[in-house]
């Protein structure tokens, strides 16, 4: 293979263009100058290089920038970004939101890859904080990114970003995160009418307080059991049997199947058995007739 290391006569690349797709791997290695590639990276995205050819181009950039690519190159990587490893990306210093957007665009429509996660981490660390513009960008590309943020970080999420969130994007959010996101969702959707509002707010209800659940029970929303089971236990406990019946509508029958699971189990324990019996579902475990219910938490607060 020694004779193949020199660039054949007349094949030296003067610019990055489509003629290079006809080069063999060794010809690309021998005939493309890394500095030329770095200055004309923006052209690569329009040209259909094979994966093997992209490997060669990446190798050339790696040799030129062993400590990590400069942002001027990173911004124009295009689909060559898909060839980068998290280890490569950890060497980068990305500070421009335009660079972040350009690379997120390359991965658009796909799940967040380890490369993208590393890129975002590098970007946020470089900026020192999650400012509104960054969050707007990240939630636009990855609404599910919200659930990877701490409650403290979520506090700076603008309500406008909530519009991009799909129900499945909140699947991995824990109650502490929903506590922060729910008021923002409530604000974002406040001008919608009853049924439309419920459709949008439904996936955020794991952060809703009791008073909001009571209000929803007056609006014939027919909450499904899956949503009910994700509500905060402390928000469900004060609801009366009548309020839960109104909240769930025809789905109230599903309580029987969930009577051993929180929050239904804990809620049943707080209700009078007489009231539970009015549902006709055979729910057991309520407070027997004639017993006095003392709210010890209220008593402690008073003493």
């Amino acid at each position: 293979e020694v004779e193949k290391t020199a660039c054949p006569s007349g094949k030296k690349a003067r610019e990055i263009d489509e003629s290079l797709i006809f080069y063999k791997k060794w010809e690309l290695e021998a005939c493309v100058d890394a500095a030329l590639l770095a200055t004309q990276m923006d052209r690569v995205n329009a040209i259909p290089f094979t994966y093997e050819q992209l490997d060669v181009l990446k190798h050339k950039l790696d040799e030129l920038y062993p400590q990590g690519y400069p942002e001027s190159v990173i911004q124009h990587l295009g689909y060559l970004f898909l060839k980068m490893s998290p280890e490569d990306i950890r060497k980068w210093n990305v500070t421009s939101l335009e660079t972040l957007k350009a690379l997120l665009e390359v991965n658009k429509g796909h799940e967040m890859s380890p490369q993208v996660a590393t890129l975002i981490d590098r970007f946020v660390k470089g900026r020192g904080q999650l400012d509104k513009d960054t969050l707007d960008t990240l939630t636009a590309f990855y609404p599910g990114y919200l659930c990877s943020l701490s409650p403290e970080e979520l506090s700076s999420v603008p309500p406008s970003s909530i519009w991009a969130v799909r129900p499945q994007d909140l699947d991995t959010c824990d109650p502490r995160q929903l506590d922060v996101l729910y008021p923002k969702a409530r604000l974002a959707f406040q001008n919608m009418n009853g049924s439309e509002y419920f459709v949008k707010i439904q996936s955020f209800l794991g952060g809703a307080p009791t008073e909001d659940l009571k209000a929803l029970s007056q609006q014939n929303v027919s909450m499904d059991l899956a949503t009910f089971m994700k509500l905060r236990t402390d928000a469900v406990l004060p609801l009366t049997v009548a309020e839960v019946q109104k909240l769930l509508g025809p789905h109230v029958e599903g309580l029987k199947a969930e009577e051993r699971h929180r929050p239904v189990r804990d809620w049943i324990l707080r209700q009078r058995q007489d009231d539970l019996d009015t549902l006709g579902l055979g729910l057991q475990g309520g407070i027997p007739n004639g017993y006095l219910v003392l709210d010890l938490s209220m008593q402690e607060a008073l003493s």
Partner: nanobody
């Protein structure tokens, strides 16, 4: 996103002809170079011909010069490859590509 769908492959005798089509949908193609690649059994991908959608520049691999013609129809957003004087060594899966986007390929078999 760009979706590319090739068609027109098949079985043909040596010396025969075929015309491959590649229908593109999604985003506009003006900013892309489009090309035909092929992969013979047990071999790597190789570029056959390319066309720069904006400038119209055509390039052919040496092994198809004078036999194959690449063309496009802007109104139909379609790329073509007219293959004449086909040889057994042209047997391969032919792929259409535009920038980072690739089609699924169409099989061309040249055999008597």
């Amino acid at each position: 996103q760009v979706q590319l769908v090739e068609s027109g492959g098949g079985l043909v005798q040596p010396g025969g002809s075929l015309r491959l089509s590649c229908a593109a949908s999604g985003r506009t193609l003006e900013s892309y170079v489009m090309a035909w690649f092929r992969q013979a059994p047990g071999k790597g991908l190789e570029a056959v011909a390319s066309i720069n959608w904006s400038s119209g520049r055509l390039i052919y691999a040496d092994f198809v010069k004078g036999r194959f013609t690449i063309s496009r129809d802007n109104s139909k957003n379609t790329l073509y490859l007219q293959m004449n004087s086909l040889r057994p060594e042209d047997t391969a899966v032919y792929y259409c590509a535009a920038g980072r986007y690739w089609g699924q390929g169409t099989q061309v078999t040249v055999s008597s």
